[in-house]
């Protein structure tokens, strides 16, 4: 049974980049408003984001607890100025989104190259280690934490005079590279999870970083 | 609770296949790494291999690739580990593991171990 | 491949005294993103499988006791056990969990004096 001029949300969609996890759905609401629940497949549904006339609800509280669960969430309708009654037996529309399991599923966020060291014919290049919203006795971990040995990247490097592109990769956060004497090099990395087998298995690539600004230095 | 039960103790011949099972319980069987460890007759472990059941993504020691094969089955929660053609070095105690909630947090539940004996 | 010595191969202990076991590896096992030094140290007590004592080298385990601990960075650790007891008996490993492949040390015997 239904509500009263009320109609079931659809297109629920998941959202989620380096753990930070939003569920989205349609439609624009005319004169309703929208509560979103959340569960993982043995556990109890949790209701956020109350009577919301937006089309998302920020997740990432609940997700970060476990982002090695499988979650599924559902929208529910009510009519506009709907206010919660013990004597209501009626149940609102709703729908289900697709399962979620973080772990595998969230995006990897666009890297950004730390910093590089120039010293002779070699070139330290080091990612930065991106913070997330996952905890551990409340201390927030990085996305290295997380994935580990599960997370590694790409180093795309080229002089700064041709478009020839080169790659190394590595499994921690830093390359070691020969450049040629004499010759300025730009970097762009990018991250990846080579265990998956989806769209989401790397990153954006990061701003390209050049040797000769501000980030880098120069030793003989 | 989490539980990781091995499949029973096998007896074989050599040039014989053979396909032991680890099956996983009280937990996301998708999102964890399922490894696989030999232990020879009084000896110490060696970590054969991983795979992740969520993508069938598998990590293989080179001292093993070719002669084992690691696969996992996500719909019953199992992962098995196949030899083709059993040799009498492979005589052994084979553990599955999983691998812990962080990354890199080492192999936090065990199986209880398969014993194999491959005599002719 | 990253190469895991242990030492020594035998430890015989009294009970109520520490003990200690180095390990070290041929290779920095440093992450450089997150500064965790990745590094486990289990126990196989006789007859059975292995259990997890410590990870991130000093990270102990969910219901390991507080007289293990483990110490060191880059390619030298310990785990350090300060007042042996009966049950500590069996065979002490430590593994790189860094790099792939995984490997283990060839293993430390405690045994009761």
């Known amino acids: 049974s239904g509500t009263t001029n009320t109609v079931a949300a659809y297109n629920l969609t998941w959202k989620s980049t380096n753990f930070k996890t939003i569920l989205e759905w349609e439609p624009k609401p005319i004169n309703q408003v929208y509560t979103v629940q959340i569960s993982t497949k043995s556990g109890d549904w949790k209701s956020k984001c109350f009577y919301t006339a937006d089309t998302e609800c920020d997740l990432t509280d609940e997700i970060v607890k476990d982002v090695k669960q499988t979650y599924l969430a559902r929208v529910f309708s009510y009519p506009a100025g709907h206010v919660e009654s013990t004597g209501s037996t009626e149940e609102p529309p709703y729908e289900n989104s697709p399962e979620f399991t973080p772990y595998l599923e969230t995006n990897l966020g666009q890297p950004t190259i730390q910093s590089f060291e120039q010293v002779g014919t070699k070139v330290n290049v080091t990612v930065q280690d991106e913070w997330t919203l996952v905890r551990r006795n409340d201390t927030f971990l990085s996305l290295r934490d997380v994935f580990g040995k599960d997370l590694i990247y790409t180093l795309y490097y080229w002089k700064s005079s041709s478009s020839g592109k080169k790659t190394a990769k590595t499994n921690t956060n830093e390359f070691l590279i020969d450049v040629d004497k004499g010759e300025n090099y730009c970097f762009s990395v990018q991250a990846v999870i080579p265990s998956r087998r989806t769209a989401n298995r790397k990153s954006t690539d990061s701003p390209v970083e050049c040797m000769g600004h501000e980030k880098g230095e120069s030793r003989e | 609770e989490v539980q990781l039960v091995q499949s029973g103790a096998e007896v074989k011949k050599p040039g014989e296949s053979l396909r032991i099972s680890c099956k996983g319980s009280?937990?996301?069987?998708?999102?964890?790494?399922i490894e696989w460890v030999r232990q020879m007759p009084g000896k110490g472990l060696e970590w054969m291999g991983d795979?992740?059941?969520?993508?069938?993504?598998?990590n293989y020691n080179e001292n093993f690739k070719g002669h084992v094969t690691i696969s996992a089955d996500k719909s019953i929660s199992t992962a098995y580990l196949q030899w083709s053609s059993l040799k009498a070095s492979d005589t052994a105690m084979y553990y599955c593991?999983?691998?812990?909630?962080?990354?890199?947090?080492?192999?936090?539940?065990w199986g209880q171990g398969t014993l194999v004996t491959v005599s002719s | 491949d990253i190469v895991m010595t242990q030492t020594p191969l035998s430890l015989p202990v009294t009970p109520g005294e520490p003990a200690s076991i180095s390990c070290k590896s041929s290779?920095?096992?440093?992450?450089?993103?997150?500064?965790?030094?990745?590094l486990t140290w289990y126990l196989q007590k006789p007859g059975q499988s292995p259990q997890l004592l410590i990870y991130?080298?000093?990270t102990r385990e969910s219901g390991v006791p507080d007289r293990f601990s483990g110490s060191g960075s880059g390619t030298d650790f310990t785990l350090k056990i300060s007042r042996v007891e009966a049950e500590d008996v069996g065979v002490y490993y430590c593994?790189?969990?860094?790099?792939?492949?995984?490997?283990f040390g060839q293993g430390t015997k405690l045994e009761i004096k």
């Open positions: 795979i992740l059941p969520g993508s069938g993504s598998t």
């Open positions: 991130w080298a000093s």
């Open positions: 593994q790189n969990d860094y790099t792939y492949p995984l490997t």
């Open positions: 593991a999983r691998s812990g909630y962080y990354g890199n947090s080492g192999f936090a539940y």
């Open positions: 290779q920095s096992l440093l992450s450089s993103g997150n500064q965790k030094n990745y």
């Open positions: 009280g937990y996301t069987f998708i999102t964890y790494w």
